[in-house]
Interface confidence: medium
């Protein structure tokens, strides 16, 4: 006896009703009463509904079933379920009994819509661009587990720092929770996508952070758009200026310098008077320009340590701030060049060449070359060690084999100062001693 | 109307760089990202990278990120794709494309007319 | 990355004959963009956001999903319709497209 059921699974809502279709081909003269149905669990055997005997023996599976009676003598053995749960999921199995018998298998894949996302946002009182923000993207009582994407504002990938939790309640349906941990620009919008992977239904909200740069009408910042260069043991100015209205006075300002990612104040001016430095005695305001808007920093004694962003926060009756970078340099001293072996050298032999070239910051880049200029890539190795001031000691070593002569040049370049200082040798074709004798 | 519109056709040596310029008229620049396609001949399409002309922010295909630079200058909206160290692979058409939508949804709406480079040595 | 792979590579079909294109991709996408290209002519927006139809474009394209499989239907083409149409997606970085499909009239 052929049994026919649909192929696909049959996807039916959380508290709809459900059809599960089955059929068969009736002979002539057929009647229920040689009709033997039985509708099971696949997996379980467990019995879900019944045609025996000529009569329908009703739902064993919670009292959520029904055959199609008036159907039954055209071989449609369907059965319906209602109010459809999340636990219903899976395979049932159709068997039909005349003389022969035949059977076949449905499934059911339930799904439940995730209901549009609700956006939090967590501080969510005066952020700043550079603050750290958690956004959350809750979709809650869906089915099955949910796929879930970020973007921002271009429509780009936010694939950073997410972390998507998913609990099923006692029903079987899914909250799920989305973090995003992301760093405010000036402004930006975030979005979160919540799919559902049966229904290819996506539900998605979005928030828009814009944050505080200032109320209106408040204080204008203005610091430089480019970092500060300044080098090892020099002073550095930090500009910040604002402009006064008419009738400012220096009792009404408040200026507080800070470094913009540990908060650690640096230097104030507040009540009428200067606070003083609060970091390691080396900043300085420029006090008799105060009143005419200038609001800079003076920091003595650069160090490498100083390197990063202050912040500049002027309050008088409205506020406004800025952060200015500060990047720290120090020159490469000229390098010294030194050859092993360096007695008797002949062409065919390997030489190794070092270039080493001191206290310098930040990190050197190092380039070797022929005396015709062309770059020596070849076997070179570099390294370069940090001592307790932060300054950089950087050693290149250049293995090659001696041409009848030849000049061999390290190039030793700050990429901040864009400073080069380089060194050479020349290695003539005799027999020769490093460094030549007198 | 919005449009890209690209410089001209380039012929260049294995080694050498090249640079495309795009163009952009009639929407506010700085409102979307630039992002640059190249197409070899015959071939499919290949994402090179883009470029926020408000933000100046990019982002590179790591096939091409050691050779690509990619700038905007705001005050001609005028988008630029520098490719160095040139090879024979390289010769395409190379195409930008305006990325517009609304959030969450995002799509190539606008593109330039596209700039042949052809490395032959 | 996340791979697009088209199928077929290359189909020629009558006029009024039913097409379908498939973009399968290597995992999740939160949607997908498709694109018509013809011969020496740059890429034109056909299908944004996984179903919407850009603008000019006939009703007789479809999208539907399955899973990972994104299959574009036309409905019963037309000699305008033949083209190269490729599959964009930028879930996650790079930006990729499928390798394409050219589709012939006979």
């Known amino acids: 006896l052929e049994v026919q059921v649909p192929e696909d699974p049959v996807v039916a809502l959380v508290g709809t009703d459900a059809t599960l279709r089955c059929s068969f081909s009736p002979e002539p003269g057929f009647s229920l009463a040689q009709l033997n149905l039985i509708w099971q669990l696949t997996d379980t055997k467990q019995l879900v509904h019944s045609f025996t005997e000529g009569r329908d023996q009703g739902s064993a599976y919670a009292n959520r079933t029904a055959l199609f009676l008036d159907l039954l003598a055209q071989g449609n053995a369907s059965l319906r379920l209602q109010r459809v749960r999340v636990a219903d999921e899976g395979s049932f199995t159709c068997f039909v009994s005349i003389r022969d018998f035949g059977s076949a298998a449905v499934s059911l894949q339930v799904a439940a819509p995730y209901s549009k996302p609700s956006m939090t946002l967590e501080p969510n009182k005066d952020l700043r661009p550079g603050d750290t923000v958690t956004i959350t993207c809750s979709s809650y009582r869906g089915y099955p587990e949910a796929e879930v994407f970020w973007q921002d504002g271009q429509g780009a990938p936010l694939t950073g720092n997410v972390t998507t939790s998913q609990m099923a309640n006692e029903q079987g349906l899914f909250d799920v929770h989305s973090v995003l941990r992301v760093v405010l620009g000036a402004n930006g919008t975030y979005s979160c996508l919540v799919r559902n992977p049966v229904l290819q239904q996506d539900a998605h909200g979005s928030i828009t952070i814009t944050p505080q740069r200032s109320p209106t009408g408040a204080v204008e910042v203005q610091v430089p758009e480019d970092p500060v260069v300044a080098l090892v043991g020099t002073d550095a100015t930090l500009r910040c200026s604002f402009s006064p209205e008419p009738g400012f006075s220096l009792a009404q300002l408040n200026l507080i310098w800070q470094l913009t990612d540990t908060k650690q104040l640096v230097h104030s001016f507040t009540e009428g008077r200067d606070q003083g430095s609060a970091y390691a005695n080396r900043t300085a305001l420029f006090l008799d320009l105060l009143a005419q808007g200038n609001a800079s920093l003076r920091l003595q004694r650069v160090r490498v340590a100083d390197e990063g962003s202050f912040t500049c926060f002027v309050s008088i009756r409205d506020f406004g701030s800025a952060a200015v970078s500060l990047q720290v340099a120090a020159p490469y001293s000229k390098p010294s060049m030194t050859l092993e072996p360096n007695k008797d050298l002949r062409p065919g032999d390997t030489v190794t060449i070092t270039c080493s070239s001191y206290r310098g910051y930040p990190e050197a880049e190092v380039f070797w070359q022929d005396g015709q200029g062309a770059p020596l890539t070849g076997n070179v190795t570099t390294s370069q060690m940090a001592n307790e001031q932060g300054l950089f000691d950087v050693h290149s070593v250049l293995r090659v084999v001696l041409g009848a002569n030849g000049t061999y040049s390290c190039l030793v370049r700050n990429p901040v100062l864009q400073q080069d200082a380089h060194g050479s040798v020349t290695i003539t074709g005799q027999p020769m001693t490093f460094p030549p004798e007198a | 109307e919005v449009q890209l519109v690209q410089s001209g056709a380039e012929v260049k040596k294995p080694g050498s760089s090249v640079k495309v310029s795009c163009k952009a008229s009639?929407?506010?620049?700085?409102?979307?990202?630039i992002h640059w396609v190249r197409q070899a001949p015959g071939q499919g399409l290949e994402w090179i990278g883009y470029?926020?002309?408000?933000?100046?922010?990019?982002d590179y295909n790591q096939k091409f990120k050691d050779r690509t630079t990619l700038t905007a200058d705001r005050s001609t909206s005028t988008a630029y794709m520098e490719l160095s160290s040139l090879r024979s692979e390289d010769t395409a058409v190379y195409y930008c494309?305006?990325?517009?939508?609304?959030?969450?949804?995002?799509?190539?709406?606008?593109w330039g007319q596209g700039t042949t480079v052809t490395v032959s040595s | 990355e996340i791979v697009l792979t088209q199928s077929p590579d290359f189909q020629s079909v009558t006029p009024k004959e039913k097409v379908t294109i498939t973009c399968r991709a290597s995992?999740?996408?939160?949607?997908m963009n498709w694109y018509q290209q013809k011969p020496d002519q740059s890429p034109k927006p056909w299908i944004y956001?996984?179903?919407n139809l850009a603008s000019g474009v006939p009703s007789r394209f479809s999208v539907s999903v399955s899973g990972t499989d994104h299959t574009l239907t036309i409905n019963s083409l037309e000699a305008e319709d033949a083209a190269t149409y490729y599959c964009?997606?930028?879930?996650?970085?790079?930006?990729?497209f499928g390798q394409g499909t050219k589709l012939e009239i006979k």
């Open positions: 956001a996984t179903s």
């Open positions: 470029i926020n002309p408000n933000s100046r922010n990019t």
């Open positions: 494309a305006r990325y517009s939508g609304s959030t969450p949804y995002w799509y190539f709406d606008v």
């Open positions: 995992s999740s996408v939160s949607y």
């Open positions: 964009q997606q930028w879930s996650s970085n790079p930006l990729t």
């Open positions: 009639g929407y506010s620049f700085t409102s979307y990202t």
